[in-house]
Interface confidence: low
């Protein structure tokens, strides 16, 4: 599923991401834009053999199990396939664990490079939330 900007903002808000660990909703929408272009089916292979999955490009080395990543920790205790669902519940729940891990949203390279320090509220402007 490819979400619309406001559609995703509403879904993320429903799942409790607005101001989760101090990060406003705009941060999460911005991260999703530059990680996956709002596509729940996005996958990208990394040079270490791990793969990033879903709308927030969650990594199989640490967070989910795809049966394909040697030494995977599966800290979110989910199959990576769950992160590709059009229902973003699994991605949101895992993202909450990631953002609580100490580095906050710096865990997402795209957020660090494209969203951090910018006007992230622009990503939810005009949305009926």
């Amino acid at each position: 599923k490819v979400f619309g900007r406001c559609e995703l903002a509403a879904a993320m808000k429903r799942h409790g991401l607005d101001n989760y660990r101090g990060y406003s909703l705009g941060n999460w929408v911005c991260a999703a834009k530059f990680e996956s272009n709002f596509n729940t089916q996005a996958t990208n292979r990394n040079t270490d053999g791990s793969t990033d999955y879903g709308i927030l490009q969650i990594n199989s080395r640490w967070w989910c199990n795809d049966g394909r990543t040697p030494g995977s920790r599966n800290l979110c205790n989910i199959p990576c396939s769950a992160l590709l669902s059009s229902d973003i519940t699994a991605s949101v729940n895992c993202a909450k664990k990631i953002v609580s891990d100490g580095n906050g949203m710096n865990a997402w390279v795209a957020w660090r490079n494209r969203c951090k320090g910018t006007d992230v509220q622009a990503w939810i402007r005009g949305c009926r939330l």
Partner: antibody, heavy 115, light 107 residues
Framework: QVQLQESGAEVMKPGASVKISCKAT????????IEWVKQRPGHGLEWIGE????????YYNEKFKGKATFTADTSSNTAYMQLSSLTSEDSAVYYC?????????WGQGTTLTVS | DIELTQSPATLSVTPGDSVSLSCRAS??????LHWYQQKPHESPRLLIK???QSMSGIPSRFSGSGSGTDFTLSINSVETEDFGMYFC?????????FGGGTKLEIK
């Protein structure tokens, strides 16, 4: 329940191409890798490669690059493998399987004869 | 590529015997090793995933053990329906590879 239904046996001439299909039912087709495996008597099982239908991502065994091409049609929950420039070495049973690192579900196999 | 060597190539047993099938990897694959059974003209069937995790519906007489490079599939008190080919497969790296198989036959 999860099922993978492959297309029927094929007899092809050397140099031709063939397209084998694998229809998936009983699970969310877009979110699991479909693997392709070759089996020839005396040669055991060989992994050809895999496709993730939802994104179209593909990974091939180097040995089969240029020989096999994977596609998937998410509207019909069907994965395809095309084999080109066929030779007698391509005569084998070809399986699709659902990939989770391990292969818990397999198609019934498609027998390809090149002669 | 990781090479998997299965031994013996053929194992002749009497129903009721207990047997062990070996799979040796050319380099360490942690526990990323899976076992399949295949009968003539049938597709492979997954018995054990990740070295020792039994699949649902698989009889309890099948068990797996090992780690690193040496792995074993054990069948406690073989039954007639157990005869066929057994393959191991690694998912530690690409390309995925299979062992050459062990044929379990009736003595």
């Amino acid at each position: 329940q999860v099922q993978l239904q492959e297309s029927g046996a094929e007899v092809m001439k050397p140099g031709a191409s063939v397209k084998i299909s694998c229809k998936a039912t009983g699970y969310t087709f877009t979110t699991y890798w479909i693997e392709w495996v070759k089996q020839r008597p005396g040669h055991g099982l060989e992994w050809i490669g895999e496709i993730l239908p939802g994104s179209g991502s593909t990974y091939y065994n180097e040995k089969f690059k240029g020989k096999a091409t994977f596609t998937a049609d998410t509207s019909s929950n069907t994965a395809y493998m095309q084999l080109s420039s066929l030779t007698s070495e391509d005569s084998a049973v070809y399986y699709c399987a659902r990939g989770d690192g391990y292969y818990g579900y397999w198609g019934q196999g498609t027998t390809l004869t090149v002669s | 590529d990781i090479e998997l060597t299965q031994s013996p190539a053929t194992l002749s047993v009497t129903p009721g015997d207990s047997v062990s099938l070996s799979c040796r990897a050319s380099q360490s694959i942690s526990n990323n090793l899976h076992w399949y059974q295949q009968k003539p003209h049938e597709s492979p069937r997954l018995l054990i995933k990740y070295t020792s995790q039994s699949m649902s519906g698989i009889p309890s007489r099948f068990s797996g053990s090992g780690s690193g490079t040496d792995f074993t599939l054990s069948i406690n008190s073989v039954e007639t329906e157990d005869f066929g080919m057994y393959f191991c497969q690694q998912s530690n790296s690409w390309p995925r590879t299979f062992g050459g198989g062990t044929k379990l036959e009736i003595k």
